[in-house]
């Protein structure tokens, strides 16, 4: 009888684990949906906003080749600053190649010094992978150095012409960047 | 944009006290929160205290609680950082940093952005 008892809880506690997975595993599907709307909505905005403007950036964004990168000048944590970007119908910068992040730190080291600086990169709870805000993984040579020691979620920021990790509550400046306008002429 | 003057930063013992200062100009102080932060060679920025627009609302880092006390002057623009028991692990530049504007709610001073000044050195020595 016991022996009983014993085996339905431990099918009851296998069935509550795997709840608790399913539950998991939705609560990250919502999260990834709504980082998706709020992508649609800002590449929208973005381009709205782009076709009452002639010129391929806005002021005080940097432009190369086809994207606009705009370098904060106040401190947010990792999401703030996420949500600051979006709010100009952006994104946290997304470094495609070694060119683009040669670009990034030329620029920085002209305009402001060896400053930490928020970019769209963070360290997935459960994998450990390190993902693009998009959900893509950066390329090798894009990974941050482990640095970070942190118990907390893990972001990637930039510093000096190196990706680095630090516990994304803390205060940093940030890059965000879109799309530059094509002209149409 | 906000303008913000730091002073008050210097070489003290430890168990000492200091009181540093930051003048706002730029914006309207009375209607957003003040902060100070600091950071340590080779560490992370951390929020060390922080105050609301009315100094309602105060917010302390649990390293400091107890030594240090944030307080604000509407009428002269300037917010207070008074450090007492200064311990050699307080050594840091100390940043004052104000609100942008429409960041955060009152009292919540994790979820705002920080325009930050120019900094001073705080050096505790044992």
């Known amino acids: 009888k016991l022996l009983q008892v014993s085996t339905i809880a431990m099918q009851q506690q296998e069935k509550l684990i795997q709840q608790e997975r399913a539950l998991l595993n939705f609560t990250e599907w919502k999260r990834s949906c709504a980082l998706q709307m709020k992508y649609c909505q800002a590449f929208m905005q973005n381009s709205l906003s782009s076709a009452h403007n002639s010129s391929p950036c806005p002021n005080n964004w940097i432009q190369n080749r086809e994207s606009c990168y705009y370098v904060s000048e106040i401190w947010s944590i990792w999401h703030t600053s996420q949500e600051n970007c979006l709010k100009e119908g952006s994104t946290l910068l997304q470094i495609e190649s070694k060119e683009e992040m040669d670009f990034i730190t030329g620029s920085l080291r002209k305009i402001k010094g060896s400053y930490d600086y928020w970019v769209g990169l963070s360290q997935d709870g459960h994998s450990g992978r390190w993902l693009w805000q998009d959900g893509s993984s950066p390329s090798p040579g894009l990974l941050p150095a482990e640095r970070s020691q942190s118990a907390n979620q893990v972001c990637g920021y930039v510093k000096s012409n190196s990706l680095l990790s630090s516990n994304c509550s803390t205060w940093k400046y940030f890059i965000c960047e879109k799309y530059a306008l094509r002209s149409s002429v | 944009q906000v303008q913000l003057q730091e002073s008050g930063g210097g070489l003290v013992q430890a168990g000492g006290s200091l009181r540093l200062s930051c003048e706002a100009s730029g914006r309207t102080f009375s209607t957003y929160a003040m902060a100070w932060f600091r950071q340590a060679p080779g560490k992370e920025r951390d929020l060390v205290a922080a105050?609301?627009?009315?100094?309602?609302?105060?917010e302390y880092h649990d390293s400091v609680k107890g030594r240090f006390t944030i307080s604000r002057d509407n009428t002269k623009n300037t917010v207070y950082l008074q450090m007492n028991s200064l311990k050699a692990e307080d050594t840091a530049v100390y940043y004052c940093?104000?609100?942008?504007?429409?960041?955060?709610?009152?009292?919540?001073?994790?979820?705002?952005?920080?325009?930050p000044g120019q900094g001073t050195q705080v050096t505790v020595s044992s």
């Open positions: 105050i609301s627009w009315s100094g309602g609302s105060t």
């Open positions: 940093a104000a609100e942008v504007e429409g960041s955060g709610r009152e009292g919540n001073f994790y979820g705002a952005s920080w325009y």
